[in-house]
């Protein structure tokens, strides 16, 4: 009866694959798939290149790369030839107002006067109370503090120059970086007299100076990297070896390891249940109930009521029960998953080149991002610079009559203004002209291009690896039947025939991702809105799109495997992959979870191992090493440790992503193999003996008793 029901379920997801005597793994005779999408993608790329050229012709990224003073003049050029550095009167206002979008569009502009200087201030200084009544000449010019805006009279009172923001009220020891003066050294600034309430100036100065010892820190960081780069590379080498070792050793230890990990999870859940019970018991005896608490948005308050712990206990108990039932009733599926993991380990061992394919993907991704960044930058800086009237404090007396944000001439600064600190500052680039008017659309095109190309590169990587690993599975006699260069042939095959299919899959994913980005943007804009209904709807939308993206990624991944094997178009491949997986949904879930668990542990092992080794080495805790292995003397020993850990994580992720792709490909091939073949002489199984054994199947022996080599 159960069998009949299963047959019905299977038929709901299509008929099992029929035997095809001509099938010998990844099809050799292919034709181009999704040609329309391929043409569309190539045209889009062509357009993207045109946008890049237009941006390059019209753009002027000097605005972002070279510093400009408040009047919009470049430092180090023209009238400021001898003044190459930009000094911000109040650098902290930059920190408070800078974000990635404003930097991309307007460069490092911030709401504080900026002046070109011949050298950055070397000493910490602040205007003393007794200097307010002195002249600008006495306080600034004669003391070689030539940091006021151009044209401030020598005999002007300092206090009025400060109120008009013509001169800086404090100076921090700075060093030039990107042509700008950035503060350094751990200085204790003298108290800023009379301006304790002036948030724009006093805002976090002491705290920020402590944390912004930029030059001092950067020099020390540079020194540390100079002393430890060799050992960081060694640590990354260790990460590489550990990752490889873990994957290759899986064929030996996959079974016991999975068992230990599952038991570990069971143990953690059991401890969780015990802990929740203890907490619940204590609070129950105290009589701490949710009814006493009432409704509160303070989540930490819920820790002190018994119902919270009871709910947690129930959830953990249910999870524990599910896991135990899975272990008891799905042990056969778990054994298949383990056998597939071992098979994947063998496949990687046979085709070690696949392990380094993520480098190709990484380089291609880097090219896509760099191209987009440069295009966006050049686009943002196309057109004539525009200047507007701006004041740091528009609520000052006398500012109410001034039309802030109206256009002005930077060469004609508004000295005749009743508004303190009124200036003509650079705002952005004009939208006159075809390119400038289309700027927003071109930027959108660029973002679309970025997402589409990134997704296409990732799709290419998945399809290439799938092709390589499929050629391993469908090799009847391993390793003799495996092609000589499986990775290269898969790469060429994918590029030549399936660019369109990959573009189609990538486009679907791109549209969902862009919808998510738009939603995130709307959510960001609505942050201040306290309407719970709106927030709830937004949350639901975001959740749905997140799920949709996850599903499409899963579907695409399996569609690319099918494309790599059969060379069919995207839709057919996606349908076939989906129906095949749905016919074996329990196996899919078990394999997916077991693989996730194993790869998570693998990452933990690699990153943890490298982290521990780095910690003991760089902190000088390993004694008795030879002279050649002596740890360097460092200012911040955590720096190379963190670098090593992050590097190890990147390397492990790269390797395990290949392994994950390998498992998925072999799994799909295995399911195909089960449906396509029956173990007879003309329809033998391609799977390994261990998988056959688990399934209780075997291949018929040929008449001459020649057994096939596995």
């Amino acid at each position: 009866m159960g069998g009949k029901q299963r047959d019905k379920d299977d038929e709901a997801y299509g008929k099992p694959v029929k035997y095809d005597p001509s099938f010998r793994g990844p099809i050799k005779n292919r034709s181009c798939t999704d040609v329309i999408c391929c043409v569309l993608f190539l045209l889009f790329i062509l357009g993207y290149i045109v946008v890049g050229i237009v941006a390059w012709l019209y753009g002027d990224p000097r605005q972002v790369l070279y510093p400009r003073n408040s009047t919009g003049a470049y430092c180090g050029m023209g009238e400021n030839k001898d003044k190459p550095y930009l000094l911000y009167f109040n650098i902290f206002s930059c920190i408070l107002s800078t974000n990635i979008i404003s930097v991309a569009e307007n460069g490092l502009q911030c709401p504080t006067p900026q002046v070109c200087v011949s050298s950055c201030p070397e000493d910490p200084w602040t205007v003393g109370k007794n200097q307010f009544s002195q002249t600008v000449g006495e306080v600034f010019y004669t003391k070689n503090r030539n940091f006021c805006l151009p044209g401030v009279p020598w005999n002007m009172m300092v206090i009025t120059s400060l109120q008009q923001e013509l001169c800086p009220s404090f100076l921090l020891p700075s060093a030039p970086a990107l042509g700008r003066c950035f503060p350094w050294t751990n200085v204790t600034l003298p108290e800023l007299p009379g301006i304790t309430n002036d948030t724009t100036i006093a805002q976090g100065i002491s705290g920020l100076i402590d944390s912004l010892n930029a030059r001092d820190i950067s020099v020390k960081i540079f020194e540390d990297f100079a002393h430890s780069w060799y050992w960081i590379l060694v640590a990354l080498g260790v990460a590489l070896l550990l990752s490889l070792l873990f994957i290759l050793l899986l064929r030996l230890v996959a079974g016991p390891l999975v068992l230990v990990l599952i038991l570990g999870v069971l143990g953690v859940l059991a401890y969780g249940i015990y802990y929740c019970w203890e907490e619940y018991r204590v609070l129950r005896d105290k009589g701490a109930s949710i009814s006493q608490l009432g409704f509160t948005t303070n989540l930490s308050a819920y820790q002190s009521v018994q119902e919270t712990w009871l709910a947690a206990l129930i959830v953990l108990a249910v999870l524990e029960a599910i896991l135990l039932l899975v272990l008891i009733f799905l042990r056969q599926r778990i054994r298949i998953a383990i056998a597939l993991l071992k098979e994947a380990s063998k496949a990687v061992g046979q085709m070690m080149s696949t392990m380094f394919y993520p480098l190709v993907t990484f380089v291609l991704l880097l090219i896509c991002i760099a191209y987009w960044a440069m295009t966006a930058l050049y686009l943002a800086t196309s057109g004539q610079p525009q200047y507007v009237l701006w004041a740091s404090n528009i609520s000052s007396p006398g500012c109410e009559k001034v039309s802030i944000n109206t256009s002005c001439n930077p060469m004609d600064q508004p000295v005749n203004s009743s508004c303190p600190g009124l200036m003509c500052v650079f705002q952005g680039y004009s939208s006159k002209g075809l390119v400038q008017r289309s700027l927003f659309n071109l930027q959108i095109y660029g973002v679309l291009g970025l997402f589409w190309t990134l997704n296409w590169v990732l799709a290419l990587g998945q399809c290439v690896l799938a092709g390589a690993f499929a050629s391993f599975y469908w090799a009847f006699h391993k390793p003799q039947d495996i092609p000589t260069f499986p990775l290269i042939s898969a790469f060429i095959r994918t590029l030549r025939y399936h660019t369109g299919s990959l573009a189609f899959g990538a486009l679907i994913l791109t549209l969902v991702q862009i919808a998510r980005v738009i939603l995130e943007y709307i959510d960001h804009k609505l942050r201040g809105v306290q309407n719970p209904v709106a927030r709830c709807i937004m949350c639901c939308f975001k959740c749905c799109l997140w799920c949709l993206e996850k599903f499409i990624k899963f579907l695409n991944r399996n569609a690319y495997i099918m494309i790599a094997i059969y060379g069919k178009n995207f839709c057919v491949s996606a349908k076939n992959a989906f129906t095949l997986l749905m016919r074996n949904i329990v196996r899919v879930v078990v394999l997916d979870k077991v693989t996730d668990l194993l790869l998570f542990f693998g990452k933990l092992l690699v990153v943890g191992g490298v982290g521990v080794l780095s910690f003991f080495f760089f902190s000088g805790r390993i004694q008795g090493l030879g002279r050649d292995f002596k740890s360097p003397h460092l200012n911040y020993y955590w720096l190379p440790i963190m670098t090593s850990i992050m590097g190890a994580y990147v390397i492990a992720s790269g390797f395990f992503s290949v392994f994950g792709m390998c498992v998925d490909t072999l799994f799909l091939c295995f399911l195909e193999d089960l449906e396509r073949n029956d173990g007879s002489l003309d329809r033998p199984y391609y799977m390994s003996k261990s998988l056959l054994k688990i399934l209780g199947k075997k291949n018929e022996a040929p008449p001459d008793n020649k057994k096939r080599k596995k």
């Epitope: 009544s133 002007m156 009172m157 009025t160 109120q163 005749n416």
Partner: antibody
């Protein structure tokens, strides 16, 4: 209430010296800058000198630079103007005036707000 | 040094009239300008500071405006006690300087 009273004026021969005083009351003298302003007979006001609250910063009009010295004694709440090498054109009513800026209010600078009644100086041979 | 000029140098007006006096600085002084009123034989009295802010105790019929180099003092409804000489003064650049004054007398 805030009050400034000038004294020390009189008739003096050219080339001689004179010292004017200004007694302040009703406010914290040591927190404010103080000015001397003069007015020649039938003419407009002419700013002479300023001394800031602690006496460290002093500034003068070009016409009196090098000849006049402004000083203050915060313990006595008194402002002084030492006038040397007097000339006929120095003949005027001399007013002392308080500067509204107390040295604490960074945000705005107001200029002079309270004036004395003046003392007359006549330079004549 | 900054030169301050006032116009007119004198004007005759009747009680209830609206009077406007202008003051010009030889270079930009932002809003660091004060207006003083002086009656014959008396000490000057501060009316306006910061070009437009009224000193405490000064009636609202006095108002000031302007910035940079051009400033005005307006008396909306002239009263007998308002007949006096009015001076403007800049106080941002040393030496501080006064305008020559504008004498307002009864027509």
């Amino acid at each position: 209430q805030v009050q400034l009273v000038e004294s020390g004026g009189g008739v003096v021969q050219p080339g001689r010296s004179l010292r004017l005083s200004c007694a302040a009351s009703g406010f914290t003298f040591s927190s404010h800058g103080m000015h001397w302003v003069r007015q020649a007979p039938g003419k407009g006001l002419e700013w002479v000198a300023v001394i800031w609250y602690d006496g460290s910063n002093k500034y003068y009009a070009d016409s009196v630079k090098g000849r006049f010295t402004i000083s203050r004694d915060n313990s006595k709440n008194t402002l002084y103007l030492q006038m040397n090498s007097l000339r006929a054109e120095d003949t005027a009513v001399y007013y002392c005036a308080r500067d509204a800026y107390s040295g604490y209010d960074y945000y705005y600078y107001y200029g002079m707000d309270v004036w004395g009644q003046g003392t007359t100086v006549t330079v004549s041979s | 040094d900054i030169q301050m000029t006032q116009s007119p140098s004198s004007l005759s007006a009747s009680v209830g009239d609206r009077v406007t006096i202008t003051c010009r600085a030889s270079q930009g002084i932002y809003t660091y300008l004060a207006w003083f009123q002086q009656k014959p034989g008396k000490a000057p009295k501060s009316l306006i500071y910061g070009a437009s802010s009224l000193q405490s105790g000064v009636p609202s019929k006095f108002s000031g405006s302007g910035s940079g180099t051009d400033f005005t003092l307006t008396i909306t409804s002239l009263q007998p006690e308002d007949f006096a000489t009015y001076y403007c003064q800049q106080y941002t650049i040393y030496p501080f300087s006064f305008g020559p004054g504008t004498k307002v007398d009864i027509k």
